[in-house]
Structure formats: C-alpha cells, structure tokens
C-alpha cells in the first residue's frame, strides 16, 4: 500500500515500500517477486528474464 | 544525491591483472544489481558483467569477452563492486563504468576509470 | 546476441526544429505490454544518462522536449524543439536478455 502523503503512482507503475518510490511495473519481468509487483495486477505475469540457451 | 567511484584504472601491460573499484552512494545499494560497462572507440558502449543480489546468491553473468577473465564481486558493507581482470589483452583498452540497475535500466553512471592495456 | 542497429550516425539539427534517430533490433525486445529498450544521451567528455526507459517513460527530470516511441523491433528518439544543450551522442540499449547490448550511437549536432 502506498504511503501517505504520497502522490498516486503514474500508469505502469506502483509503490514500492522497500525503495520508497514508485517504480515501473515493467521490471516486474525481470524481478517479479519485488513488493511493488503486487500493485501491478494489469501487467501479465512473465518468466524470469532469458540469459543465454 | 547518487555518486559512483570507480577507480583502479591505468597502464598495464598485455597478460597483466588489474582490479576496479566502484564505491556507491545514495541509494539502497543491496536492492540494486551492480553493472561494469565499458566504452572505447572501437566497440562504443559495451556490458561486461553485473552482479545481483545476496538472496540471489550474488549471481554473476560475463560478456562472452570477459568470461573466464573477469571476475565481479560486491561488498555490501561497504557498498562496493569489483572488477578484476587477468589476462588482459590490448582490445581492453577503455574506460570502465560502474551503473546500478533495478531490472532494466542503468540509471546512473560514475566518471569511469581509464584502462590501457599496452606494452 | 541482440544486435542494435543506430541510424543516422551522425546528423546535424538547426536550434528548434526535430530531431529523430532511429534503433532497429535484430529480434523483438517488447512483450504485449512493455518495450525492453532504453535511450542515453552522453554529453562530449561526460558519462552516460538515462533518458528514456521502456520505449516511451522519460526518466525523472528528462525535458518533455524528449520522447520515445516504438516496439518489437524498430524504435525511435525524437527531440523536439533541440536545444544546444542537447549536442550529445545518444546510445539505444535493450534489456530484453543478456548480454545486454548497445547501439553504436548518434552523434547530434545543433546548427
């Protein structure tokens, strides 16, 4: 949940209470088990990030 | 305010080892993965290592260039990133930066420190 | 590995008007919901910045004179109006997997 006194996230992003700042759900892909990844239900989940074959 | 510190750079000669540092500050830099990249005149901008986290059991990936050569390594109470290199070759030659990433995104950079591999 | 592909290499732009620089991939970098790729603009004898991240979210503090468009494999940076500050080498880069890989970069200069 997003701190108080604090302004709403933009679109694509969420609160993360561990970095004190909104962050880009975007990076939910390559680290999806960050606190914020739980505001960002729209973004579909995704595997881990791909290293090489 | 971010600040990044990299130093260690220098002349060594081809074969040589050297060790970067990269001392971090202003933001919470055990969330964060550790980069080195590199930049020179003939290969531009160039990722050469990152390191994770410790509930990633600090995970370590190279560039295919710097794999068996180069080894990162962190130090979270100091706030630190390593970078020792053995067996260098002159197509070393660069500026090495350290850079904080989250997932995706190198949001800051340090100075660099200068490489020159040459006899 | 994932080539990044700048163009022009170099261009130069009058003070106000457009400028547009191009990022091609050799394989897409974007899912059905986000681009992997990021812009830098390095200044002459300075250190990378982030400008743009995930094809289109300007960086905290970025000018509004910067946006990015674009997804799977074709991308593109405009700058409009430019301004002298904005002389500069600007650097696509993806995140899509590792290694992560660079463009070969854009060197802008203001007329």
């Known amino acids: 949940e997003q701190a108080p006194g604090q302004a709403p996230c933009s679109r694509g992003s969420s609160w993360s209470a561990d970095l004190d700042k909104c962050m880009d759900c975007a990076s939910c892909r390559a680290r999806p088990h960050s606190d914020f990844c739980l505001g960002c239900a729209a973004a579909p989940p995704a595997p881990f990030r791909l290293l090489w074959p | 305010e971010v600040k990044l510190g990299e130093s260690g750079g220098g002349l060594v000669q081809p074969g040589g080892s050297m060790k970067l540092s990269c001392v971090a500050s202003?933001?919470?830099?055990?969330?964060?993965?550790m980069n080195w990249v590199r930049q020179s005149p003939e290969k531009g901008l160039e990722w050469v290592a990152e390191?994770?986290?410790?509930?990633?059991?600090?995970?370590?990936h190279y560039a295919e260039s710097a794999k068996g050569r180069f080894t990162i390594s962190r130090d979270d109470s100091r706030s630190s990133v390593y970078l020792q290199m053995n067996n260098l070759r002159a197509e070393d030659t660069a500026i090495y930066y350290c850079s904080p990433t989250y997932a995706d995104t190198m949001d800051y950079w340090g100075q660099g420190t200068s490489v020159t591999v040459s006899s | 590995d994932i080539v990044l592909t700048q163009s022009p290499a170099s261009l130069a732009v009058s003070l106000g008007q457009r400028a547009t620089i191009s990022c091609k991939a050799s394989?897409?970098?974007?899912?059905?919901?986000?681009?992997?790729m990021q812009w830098y603009q390095q200044r002459p004898g300075q250190s990378p910045k982030l400008l743009i991240k995930?094809?289109?979210k300007l960086d905290s503090g970025v000018p509004a004179r910067f946006s990015g468009s674009g997804s799977g494999t074709d991308f593109t940076l405009n700058i409009h109006p430019v301004e002298e500050e904005d002389t500069a080498t600007y650097y696509c880069?993806?995140?899509?997997?590792?290694?992560?890989?660079f463009g070969g970069g854009t060197r802008l200069e203001i007329k």
């Open positions: 880069q993806h995140s899509w997997e590792l290694p992560y890989t």
């Open positions: 394989q897409s970098v974007s899912t059905s919901t986000y681009s992997y």
């Open positions: 202003g933001f919470p830099f055990t969330k964060y993965w």
């Open positions: 390191i994770r986290l410790k509930s990633d059991n600090y995970a370590t």
């Open positions: 995930y094809a289109s």
